[in-house]
Interface confidence: low
């Protein structure tokens, strides 16, 4: 039960995270014009990974895309690439994790296969989250560097000697969305990896021996003893040693040296 809950929660958290990464990538507010000491009160500039916008005091907003590819800074291209890789990996991870969910039965898929798929999706979510966090952090670093450079230029430029100064841009909402989303995807991935450990059938050097008495079923496992009566909740005589995942009907697939009736 705990494994199913962990896996399900990991899936939901990752789903929210990846939705957030997609939202952040599409958002225009990656950098917003720093309004501190800014004489232009009529307009407000903000920029995203794909286009830049200007909002007037009237509320009208005009956006234009970056129609060139070669002219854009390498750092911006790198951020775009990281975010897209994050989205693609996350999307594949989601697809894999849907089939890996314990609550969904697909044919006669073994628990070991589900465990492998859960681990795969978990790793994909972790890498996806790291890509998003890295992308947003690279952009934030680019902004911080640019902010202080342009602050220096601004004060030297106001004297009329330097004729070009750079507008100062600060963190936009998309950066915070990206950081949170990346973190959620990362946490979801870790949860999936934890769930994988619970899903994987425990392998022992010795085959467990099952003793069946009339009306009672007792299962022994090397390294410990668990018993359950044939009456009550365990009416199907589930073997305790593998977490109750298989019924007694499935014993035939695991022949033992000693079968007692």
């Amino acid at each position: 039960m705990a494994v199913t809950a962990c896996q399900g929660l990991g899936f939901v958290v990752s789903l929210i995270g990846i939705a957030g990464i997609i939202a952040a990538t599409c958002m225009d507010q990656w950098s917003t014009q720093d309004l501190y000491n800014n004489p232009v009160t009529a307009v407000f500039n903000y920029q995203g990974l794909w286009r830049s916008c200007v909002r007037e005091s009237s509320g009208f907003t005009e956006c234009r895309g970056y129609f060139t590819l070669l002219g854009l800074p390498a750092m911006l291209q790198a951020v775009r690439a990281l975010m897209i890789v994050g989205i693609v990996l996350g999307a594949i991870g989601l697809l894999v994790s849907i089939f890996a969910l314990k609550c969904i039965r697909i044919g006669s898929m073994e628990d070991s296969a589900k465990a492998n798929m859960t681990l795969t999706s978990g790793i994909m979510f972790i890498v996806s989250g790291l890509c998003a966090i890295a992308g947003v952090s690279v952009f934030a670093n680019m902004l911080v560097t640019n902010f202080w450079m342009s602050t220096a230029n601004m004060y030297t430029g106001m004297g009329g000697m330097v004729q070009t100064v750079q507008t100062r841009y600060t963190f936009g909402a998309a950066l915070f969305v990206g950081w949170v989303a990346g973190g959620l995807t990362l946490i979801g991935g870790v949860m999936m990896c934890i769930a994988c450990r619970g899903l994987a059938p425990e392998e022992t050097n010795y085959k467990a021996v099952s003793y069946h008495a009339s009306g009672h079923s007792v299962a022994y496992k090397p390294g410990g003893f668990k018993a359950s009566t044939g009456f009550g909740s365990n009416t199907k005589n589930k073997k305790i040693y593998d977490g109750g995942a298989r019924t007694e009907d499935e014993v035939q697939s695991y022949p033992s040296k000693h079968d007692y009736v």
Epitope: S31, Q33, V40, A42, V43, N45, Q47, S52, C53, V54, E56, S57, S58, F60, E62, R64, G65, Y66, F67, T68, G71, L72, P73, L76, N146, S150, G157, Q163, T164, V165, Q166, T167, Y169
Partner: nanobody
């Protein structure tokens, strides 16, 4: 490199008129906000008027009703029609442009060299 070239400054009597123009060249502009700022001797640079690429204008309270800003998007030029000039309008007038070119991810503030407007009798 983007260049802003101003023209039209000079000496004018109080109550007179002047028309300043500023032409931007050297870049393809994706979004532009252009305008005029002025700096009187010993004072800070202050906003006179701005105009966006869509034509929305913004004026300093001291020039409202006397100055008119207009722009020509095709020529990347901004004009400042100054009427009923007063001695306190005497200053160096700087052309300003906040332009984002496809090659500039960050918007750039460009300033002209400035043109002197003297209002005196």
């Amino acid at each position: 490199q983007v260049q802003l070239v101003e023209s039209g400054g000079g000496l004018v009597q109080p109550g007179g008129s002047l028309r300043l123009s500023c032409a931007a060249s050297g870049g393809i502009f994706s979004i532009g906000v252009m305008g005029w700022y002025r700096q009187a001797p010993g004072k800070q640079r202050e906003l006179v008027a701005t105009i966006t690429s869509r034509g929305s204008t913004n004026y300093a309270d001291s020039v409202k009703g006397r100055f008119t800003i207009s722009g020509d998007n095709a020529k990347n030029t901004v004009y400042l029609q100054m009427n009923n000039l007063k001695p306190e309008d005497t200053a160096v007038y700087y052309c300003y442009a906040d332009l984002i070119r496809p090659g500039d991810f960050y918007g750039m503030d460009y300033w002209g060299q400035g043109t002197l407007v003297t209002v005196s009798s």
